[in-house]
């Protein structure tokens, strides 16, 4: 326990001290005090360097004194014969005696007292960096204005830390710049910019003067920049030794300025600014960037537009452009989006045609549609070649995205009709000679197929039966054969509006406008035994001249039979209308003068008894196309006649082409009534 004073006496004092003694005393006074040790009596065997007997005074590791011999006071007013003053609060006193004493020695008497020390002046090392203030039992340090006392309570520094700079541009300087900076300070400045900006520091050489490095090259005062795991510096000396532009590649920078106790210089001044993070100019295939720039930085937005034929796809939908932003991490957003070739998909099938399986359905691929030849041809041209276009559609140079249409080839029989075997008034024929021939079983009559959905016949055939049963594709109309042929189901019958409907059709004398159309429920599939006949053109080339030959076919009455089972046909010339007028009506139902003859009728026949007859009605009078000799067109329809085997009258189809086309056009979609 520390004490303020005390007494120390040699063993047996004031009697003689014994031989061979070693005794020590540890003196301790309170902290902040020194020790005044004084001897009032000293009588110890004298020897050189006090080698035999001695009293030793030790402070720490230092011997303050070693005493022996006799002493008396020099001052008559003071009993002190020897004294020690130490500025420490601990002291050790050690007394030693050897094995013999030639005389009787009484030893020593000593006293110690705690004395105040002036820590501010008594030591070589000044305890305070700035102002030292002594008081009894201690001292305290204080600082000049604008300085503060560090936690060690000894050192003063300036309050230069804690500043956080968030502006995109700024200036930072050492304290008091350009006056000398404070000693013994650690200044920390923080720059914290928004993510997406990197701190760039700019220093001028002349704006930097910091105490130079020591002989080992270590900076005594130093400026250091820390950006994440990168450090720039330490820097010191006269004139900035580092790069004048420091690109930190970080949005956060710590600036640390450390000074020691000596050598103050003017310090430093720097400027900083936030540079937006750059994003790389990436090479994105099959696309263009807008705007195009040499350098892209944080917050720049580009529109990436795919080149024609390329798109960005997500799931089942796509887009031709997207936006990408240069982000705070120096990378582009939407970098996963890539322009890939447009996929036109599997081409749509077409009726009566086909498309070969494409090797690829991607942009630029080519496909070819073909029609089922020789029964169908491509009506809307374009050659059938389509390429996968940039908009994802299969496109033809002529039709664009419209699909080709395979329509039946008209007027071309698979086998030409040859009059081989002469039958009375005609020849046996095969359905392949007249693939357009339609058979009506009630009434027994004929018709002509003109396309997939329409049959042309005479009005008088269908006026009594608006739901006729029709057959195509069979030479024979025996029941067993018809069962194997194609039956056509009517959807609607259209009789020419000029055809006069009678209550008693048997007494008819006016066959003007004897023409009708039957719309079929389902399209007819064409082939070698079923294909349509052409309609006449509207030009004068299709005006018939007397003597022009035409073919008629049907299962009507022959000389031998009322009805034919196998198809018959004959080649007849066109005759003047008067020839028909001159023939006496076989079984007149009225006065001969009552029969009406009009320009809507063609007269034909009169050669070798070849003629159409009852049961052939509605069948086509087929004439070779003047503009294409390989084709036949329906110049007429079997209508009526004065007498079988002479001349017959046929509805002049050319006069009805407009009505036929209009009727078909207006009723092209299946009716729902």
């Amino acid at each position: 326990e520390p004490t303020m004073y005390g007494e120390i006496l040699s063993p047996n004092y004031p009697q003689a001290y014994p031989s061979e003694v070693e005794k020590s005393w540890d003196i301790e006074v309170p902290e902040g005090y020194g020790i005044h040790l004084y001897f009032t009596h000293l009588d110890i065997e004298l020897s050189e360097n006090c080698a035999y007997d001695s009293v030793q005074i030790i402070s720490g590791d230092t011997e303050e004194g070693r005493l022996c011999g006799q002493r008396s006071s020099n001052n008559p007013h003071s009993p002190i014969v020897e004294e020690f003053q130490v500025p420490y609060n601990k002291l050790q006193v050690i007394f030693k005696s050897d094995f013999s004493n030639e005389e009787r020695f009484t030893g020593f008497a000593a006293y110690y007292v705690a004395t105040d020390i002036n820590e501010c002046t008594d030591f070589v090392d000044v305890p305070c960096s700035h102002f030292c203030n002594n008081f009894i039992g201690g001292y305290f340090c204080s600082c000049p204005p604008e300085y503060f006392l560090h936690d060690d309570m000894k050192n003063c520094g300036v309050n230069c830390s804690g500043d956080v700079f968030t502006a995109l541009i700024g200036e930072i300087a050492s304290p008091n710049y350009p006056k000398p900076y404070p000693e013994n300070s650690r200044c920390e400045y923080q720059i914290r910019l928004e993510k997406g900006f990197q701190v760039v520091v700019t220093l001028r050489r002349e704006d930097f003067d910091v105490e130079a490095a020591d002989s080992a090259g270590n900076c005594l005062d130093s400026l250091v920049f820390v950006a994440g795991d990168r450090q720039f510096g330490p820097y010191c000396g006269h004139g900035f030794p580092g790069p004048l532009n420091i690109e930190t590649k970080s949005n956060a920078l710590d600036i640390i300025f450390q000074t020691d106790l000596t050598g103050q210089k003017k310090g430093w001044k720097l400027r900083y600014h936030g540079d937006p993070m750059p994003c790389p100019k990436e090479d994105t295939p099959n696309s263009v960037w807008e705007p195009a720039k040499a350098k892209y930085v944080f917050r720049d937005v580009v529109q990436i537009t795919c080149l024609d034929g390329f798109e960005v796809v997500e799931g089942r939908v796509g887009a031709t452009s997207f936006y990408s932003t240069c982000q705070s991490n120096g990378k582009w957003s939407n970098s996963k989006l890539k322009c890939q070739p447009v996929d036109c998909g599997i081409p749509e099938p077409i009726e009566n045609g086909k498309v070969e399986d494409p090797e690829s359905t991607l942009f630029g691929s080519v496909i070819r549609y073909t029609c089922e030849e020789p029964y169908y041809y491509m009506e809307n041209g374009g050659g059938g070649e389509y390429h996968c276009a940039g908009n994802g559609s299969w496109v033809n140079e002529v039709l664009g995205p419209e699909l080709p249409k395979c329509v039946p080839v008209c007027g071309v029989p698979r086998e030409p009709f040859e009059e081989k075997q002469r039958i009375i008034g005609g020849s046996d024929a095969d359905i392949k000679n007249f693939p357009w021939q339609v058979f009506f079983d009630n009434p027994w009559a004929g018709g002509a197929l003109i396309n997939e959905y329409w049959v042309l016949t005479a009005a008088h055939v269908v006026e009594g039966n608006r739901e006729p049963t029709m057959y195509v594709g069979s030479t024979s109309v025996q029941t067993s054969r018809l069962a194997k042929s194609k039956m056509l189901t009517p959807e609607h019958v259209f009789i020419h509006p000029g055809w006069k409907l009678l209550e008693v059709p048997e007494g008819r004398t006016n066959f003007d406008n004897d023409i009708a159309l039957v719309r079929l429920k389902d399209p007819v599939k064409m082939g070698p035994t079923v294909s349509p006949i052409c309609l006449p053109g509207t030009s004068s080339d299709y005006n018939l001249m007397d003597g022009d030959l035409g073919l008629i076919s049907g299962w009507g009455r022959t000389e031998k039979r009322d009805r034919a089972v196998r198809l018959k046909a004959a080649r007849l010339p066109v005759a003047p209308l008067r020839k028909c007028k001159e023939v006496k009506v076989e079984k007149p139902t009225a006065d001969a003068e009552a029969y009406v003859f009009t320009p809507n009728m063609i007269c034909a026949g009169g050669e070798k008894g070849m003629d159409s007859c009852k049961g052939d009605s509605g069948g086509a009078f087929a004439v070779q196309d003047p503009n294409d000799k390989t084709k036949f067109y329906a110049a007429g329809l079997v209508s009526w006649g004065p007498q079988c085997g002479t001349y017959g009258l046929y509805t002049r189809v050319k006069n009805y082409v407009d009505w036929i086309m209009k009727t078909m056009q207006e009723n092209s979609t299946p009716r729902e009534d």
């Epitope: 917050r299 997500e314 997207f322 936006y323 989006l337």
Partner: antibody
């Protein structure tokens, strides 16, 4: 088919953290961005951030910067969102969503309740 | 950040009505705008992307238009299943911000 299945509802105390998972099936998350969007009760949608699971790049909305961490485990095809220092106003339904061009598929949502 | 403002906040309409919701961006977002529909207790569903493209499976009565800062979502003839909350969202630049929503209610 494409599905995003999120972890179950959580109740947390203020100051705690929550980690919500989003397991993807029917596609590889490395080919898409995985976003997190939250919706406070009776409030609108609020975008929090996204991750590119291919390279672990993340972008966060400034509001959540420092509090949110979005991660992805490509081996399990799962994305995660961790929100720390929770406060009562973080009570919301948290959705994950997949995108390239747009947010075409969303998780069913995870209700996180923050209450003392 | 880009702010997205929808109007109206709520709207009452009847089945068969034609309805228009508008969305305004605080800065140009070109055509990088999507529309979502959300019903109570459900996740949002994408309706329109890139301002005017209908997402697959979305009925044709939904259409979007606009570019730059002004956008509209139109429902040509309201059906009972269309009563929900609709949100616009810009994907022009991060953060991808949403409008505050428009609640469509039965009159």
């Amino acid at each position: 088919q494409v599905q995003l299945v999120q972890s179950g509802a959580e109740v947390k105390k203020p100051g705690a953290s929550v980690k919500v998972s989003c397991k993807a099936s029917g596609f590889n998350i490395k080919e898409y961005y995985m976003h997190w969007v939250r919706q406070a009760p009776e409030q609108g949608l609020e975008w929090m951030g996204w991750i590119d699971p291919e390279n672990a790049d993340t972008i966060y909305a400034q509001k959540f910067q420092g509090r949110v961490t979005i991660t992805a485990d490509t081996s399990t095809n799962t994305a995660y969102m961790e929100l720390s220092s929770l406060r009562s106003e973080d009570t919301a339904v948290y959705y994950c969503a997949r995108s390239r061009l747009f947010f075409a598929y969303w998780g069913q949502g995870t209700l996180v309740t923050v209450s003392s | 950040d880009i702010q997205m403002t929808q109007s109206p906040k709520s709207l009452s309409a009847s089945v068969g009505d034609r309805v228009t919701i508008t969305c305004r961006a605080s800065q140009d977002v070109r055509t990088a705008l999507d529309w979502y529909q959300q019903k109570p207790g459900q996740s949002p569903k994408l309706l329109i992307y890139s301002a005017s493209y209908r997402y697959s499976g979305v009925p044709s009565r939904f259409s979007g238009s606009g570019s730059g800062t002004d956008f509209t979502l139109t429902i040509s003839s309201l059906q009972p299943e269309d009563f929900a909350t609709y949100y616009c969202q810009q994907q022009y630049t991060t953060p991808y911000t949403f409008g505050q929503g428009t609640k469509l209610e039965i009159k």
